[in-house]
Amino acid sequence: KSSNEATNITPKHNMKAFLDELKAENIKKFLYNFTQIPHLAGTEQNFQLAKQIQSQWKEFGLDSVELAHYDVLLSYPNKTHPNYISIINEDGNEIFNTSLFEPPPPGYENVSDIVPPFSAFSPQGMPEGDLVYVNYARTEDFFKLERDMKINCSGKIVIARYGKVFRGNKVKNAQLAGAKGVILYSDPADYFAPGVKSYPDGWNLPGGGVQRGNILNLNGAGDPLTPGYPANEYAYRRGIAEAVGLPSIPVHPIGYYDAQKLLEKMGGSAPPDSSWRGSLKVPYNVGPGFTGNFSTQKVKMHIHSTNEVTRIYNVIGTLRGAVEPDRYVILGGHRDSWVFGGIDPQSGAAVVHEIVRSFGTLKKEGWRPRRTILFASWDAEEFGLLGSTEWAEENSRLLQERGVAYINADSSIEGNYTLRVDCTPLMYSLVHNLTKELKSPDEGFEGKSLYESWTKKSPSPEFSGMPRISKLGSGNDFEVFFQRLGIASGRARYTKNWETNKFSGYPLYHSVYETYELVEKFYDPMFKYHLTVAQVRGGMVFELANSIVLPFDCRDYAVVLRKYADKIYSISMKHPQEMKTYSVSFDSLFSAVKNFTEIASKFSERLQDFDKSNPIVLRMMNDQLMFLERAFIDPLGLPDRPFYRHVIYAPSSHNKYAGESFPGIYDALFDIESKVDPSKAWGEVKRQIYVAAFTVQAAAETLSEVA
């Protein structure tokens, strides 16, 4: 049941009033406004947009709106020395060159400052050598190459198709395999859905379209030169050699027309199986090198990008809480884009803008939320979540004491099929209850709830009659709040049908073709999916900021902890002999989970019964709920990943986008059969079980009666 217990309350100032104020037409208008020119991080255009948003949020009625600036390491192509890849003959002559940039979309021919496709933070270099095709460049792809096929990537240039995992993991894997350069490309198998035209006549990727993106392996560090601390005016900066997460080999992205020219000549080994074949008319030979007639030809990369310390600007808006102003509910999404940002991020930024407008309208009518709501327009997300991370580093002491929840608001859509939610288990019940109150925008579900269409289209694999809610991974601005600070976090957007569309993300992701027209013509002409996402994100923020008792259910954490413990135990049990030899036991973990379950159950009973009119007891119970997520934080962090401190969840070490449960144990067990010192390896497994068990038990105790 929605709450309406803020100060100056009148019957209309409740969740319904807030939701009714949200308008699809406004989101459409804001999206158009935000996408007419590029807003690359560190540019004047993006600074001007920051000031525009600051001004508009003030007009909408927020109490204060400030710019928070930082000087962080960014990366740009050299304007006079473009990046490209060549095929060179035995004389060193370039007989083929890849495109220098994408052909512009219709209507944008005269737009200046479109950054050409590049891999942000690639070092400079002009390596030349034989090509090896490495499929998606996942950990398992390199295992297949090196262990099964005995192909050595050392000193080779590897070509990998985008998709499946974060591009930074691909580059890291290539580096570890000894490659001297990486070419990333979009294969039509992953970025061209059958039966759909390419842009501008549909939402598929044209042959000249290219995905930009950063290739860092920051592991939550933020600005590579100031890990752990804000990149402010008096910051001490590391030298570039000590910077966190920078790639050591040149990397460059290309489209499938250019990839065709590189792959069609490949010789060497045939692909190991059909999963290594894309949709181009090429053999997908692994190499190394080109086939017979072309064996003397090599591939040469020409990369001249530069890393530069550049000023970025977050916009931080505040709507002060009437009752608990020292409790913060944060709604944040980024503003910087690679080019026009039609989907990423402006479909999210437009939704945030409308949510701010709606809250502002209520505030102008005398309403205030119970708790403070902070709104953020983050900068430099595309360069490694830099704006959000620097701000959180600067405000970490406040956030860890006052942070109730963080709701992320990047792209509102990646498809138009159904809802997709990733969040802490604490928010499961909030999401379920909210979506039951919202109308579904889906065709065939007129008059039905969002919960119903979502559950039908994306059912939970474990619980019948419930929708799938996924683990939080990373690759977006919630990372620092959840993985480092332990603030309950969630995200929601409309997505594609993953069963019928096997391509990775959406085809035009991070290309010049991600325009307003892409959204308006092909994804959401009525902006009804955007409106639904605004209702979900805004509704979550409203309820988190306004409900008397925080809408967190700790029993849902108990359920998933048991599931995760079972899962990690079954992984370990693939090695029964070693578990016996090294006396590996999960008893402590299962015991801690059992204790957590019992204590959470008792806490929930007390939560139903306590005197909500007693502000001290109310605050005490709410603090136990707020600090539960914090209790899963290990101040020492995960091994070699000090800024990933959540013991239950972390981004996968093999794919930043994916969440892994009990990551410390998982990583200790990963590929353990190949470790040179099994005794040491299983000792680390035991240590990680100990850390996990202790953390779960400690978290459980935060829910016990205080005295």
Partner: antibody
Amino acid sequence: EVQLVESGGGLVQPGGSLRLSCAASGFTFSDYYMAWVRQAPGKGLEWVANINYDGSSTFYADSLKGRFTISRDNSKNTLYLQMNSLRAEDTAVYYCGRQVGYYDPMDYWGQGTTVTVSS
Amino acid sequence: DIQLTQSPSSLSASVGDRVTITCRASSSVSHMYWYQQKPGKAPKPWIYRTSNLASGVPSRFSGSGSGTDYTLTISSMQPEDFATYYCQQYHSYPLTFGQGTKLEIK
């Protein structure tokens, strides 16, 4: 075999109108963009207009906007160019061509039809 | 609009000569396309996406370039190569052609 056959050319007075047609065969017409290109006597090639698969998007040379209209009838596998307010400088051979998509070149051309604008 | 300037406008060559035609764009384009036209005939696609030979085009033809400067090269002129060659950009609309280069027998 892909075939494009233009028709409708002829002699017309300045200020007059003409409608060119291009009959397509040997391929799925609705799967391709189509274009018109012209060539004045003794001169080079000049792009006139093109049209997307279903006719919902059209593109024109700036100098011809408002006078020329490109259209298509996918049920008849035919491309059209309606030319109004014709001028002497519109005298040319008009070729129709096929494009895979917006960013792709004309991979097949017709043999052309001659338009002469003269009093 | 992107202007394309071909040079030379005309060229006299002998059979066996190596011939290079250049096409300069007024601003950068991602690729260049080339057509061959013989008198009284429709143009034929000759080179696509800068360096790819169209079906049936002899291997003595090659294309190269990037940014604003592109070339079509004939390594050894043959009698059937005497024709007019046009460059065209499909990078951005309006689509534009070069003014043509006429190859004549010396």
